[in-house]
Interface confidence: medium
Amino acid sequence: IFPLAFFIYVPMNEQIVIGRLDEDIILPSSFERGSEVVIHWKYQDSYKVHSYYKGSDHLESQDPRYANRTSLFYNEIQNGNASLFFRRVSLLDEGIYTCYVGTAIQVITNKVVLKVGVFLTPVMKYEKRNTNSFLICSVLSVYPRPIITWKMDNTPISENNMEETGSLDSFSINSPLNITGSNSSYECTIENSLLKQTWTGRWTMKDGLHKMQSEHVSLSCQPVNDYFSPNQDFKVTWSRMKSGTFSVLAYYLSSSQNTIINESRFSWNKELINQSDFSMNLMDLNLSDSGEYLCNISSDEYTLLTIHTVHVEPSQETASHN
């Protein structure tokens, strides 16, 4: 038998919990351990989220939106744990939750403010549009609205466009920057202040290389230490721009240490890779190899783009044959 008696005044306290979209979270609530425990979780002081008394859940009047998504830590209730395990949070779950706990020795009302954030990994893209070159920082799904900043050669750029589309539960954002004719380095930072998560995209253009047909070219790609952490999973992709689109030459996955090469003349130095140097060699150059080569090192926290322009010129032999 679990009779009811709620005692002792404890001032209402408020905690903030930050969850990520579609992930599970815990809304904390503790109380002075005692017998006759009654726990009621409510949302916005109105909707019943979870009820427990007489030693078991009573979910008959639970609001349907919480069905199969809530549970308590049943083995720990006797130790004063009234926390709520909350599955698959959505942005609609944001708000104030009240935990009302009664025992034979106290009554407490705890408030938990749930904030939900979204931050699908952003990307930095390099695009050619007619004769113009653009860098685009974009994030497919983010909430709340992020702060986007651009720098050119480490100096903040005040002007930046932001193309925003809002859906029911998040924003999709593109921030394009026209870099036509520029040899500067660019950096784009996207910050989700709620999740305290920052992503940085960095773009560097290397000096143009002039090579003769049949020669080989070495293109450097070394991450900037400020961003790069070899302990974190990342991916390296080398691609070549052809008629406005990039084709992938090779990529490397740090998690599996796999290298996949799509171009037989492409080579990577395994020893250099182990030293976090992703420079590549392209052998036996031909005229059609002229163009832009892009090294993309990406993780959840950054994208580092390095562009090389290669000009392949006919060798003297070829020229004299013509």
Epitope: F2, P3, L4, Y9, T109
Partner: antibody, heavy 119, light 107 residues
Framework: QVQLQQSGAELVRPGVSVKISCKGS????????MHWVKQSHAKSLEWIGS????????NYNQKFKGKATMTVDKSSSTAYMELARLTSEDSAIYYC????????????WGAGTTVTVSS | DIQMTQSPSSLSASLGERVSLTCRAS??????LSWLQQKPDGTIKRLIY???TLDSGVPKRFSGSRSGSDYSLTISSLESEDFADYYC?????????FGGGAKLEIK
């Protein structure tokens, strides 16, 4: 049906004690806490305290500590409240009220016991 | 302790009239508020709990609502048996506290 039957009116002299009762029927007595409430002309309604009818644990409003003592007799399904060292300030109607789990407190009230302190 | 300030303390109204009583909480009580009715013979009955949930058997003309820290009881169309005293009660934390009461009289 659920009922709380309170003892009859009391006329007592200042300085003495009085013990009033509240008998629960129509439900499992030990499943619910019992609250006691004072109603005087000057102070509207005041919560005195509550008692766990199963464990006997008590909780008092600070203001009534030393004045009220709550007890319970499970065998007769009766809750008691004793008021000590009575003064004219204690003249009031005293109600017992039952707690509940899902719809909370004070969902069933007794009819009240009038206590008059007079010399 | 949480103070509950109830207004008005008395109110005269006619049969069929709509009336509202208000209680203001000095601290956040998260909707843990009941409305009680006391008849002239002293009988106390709970009408509403959790701000707006009607007890079984309570006529639909009674309703409860909340705006911030203000809690209201509304009777949409007064009937003769509604003339009584009304109290609000907070049970968010002990000591539980009551409003000063409102006497609803027939005009």
């Amino acid at each position: 049906q659920v009922q709380l039957q309170q003892s009859g009116a009391e006329l007592v002299r200042p300085g003495v004690s009085v013990k009033i009762s509240c008998k629960g029927s129509g439900y499992t007595f030990t499943d619910y806490a019992m609250h006691w409430v004072k109603q005087s002309h000057a102070k509207s309604l005041e919560w005195i305290g509550s008692i766990s009818t199963y464990y006997g644990d008590t909780n008092y409003n600070q203001k009534f500590k030393g004045k009220a003592t709550m007890t319970v007799d499970k065998s007769s399904s009766t809750a008691y409240m004793e008021l000590a060292r009575l003064t004219s300030e204690d003249s009031a109607i005293y109600y017992c009220a039952r707690g509940n789990y899902d719809d909370w407190y004070f969902n069933v009230w007794g009819a009240g016991t009038t206590v008059t302190v007079s010399s | 302790d949480i103070q509950m300030t109830q207004s008005p303390s008395s109110l005269s109204a006619s049969l069929g009239e709509r009336v509202s009583l208000t209680c203001r909480a000095s601290q956040d009580i998260s909707g843990y508020l009941s409305w009680l009715q006391q008849k002239p013979d002293g009988t106390i009955k709970r009408l509403i709990y959790s701000t707006s949930t009607l007890d079984s058997g309570v006529p639909k003309r009674f309703s409860g609502s909340r705006s911030g820290s203000d809690y209201s009881l509304t009777i949409s169309s007064l009937e003769s048996e509604d003339f009584a005293d009304y109290y609000c009660l907070q049970y968010a934390s002990s000591p539980y506290t009551f409003g000063g009461g409102a006497k609803l009289e027939i005009k």
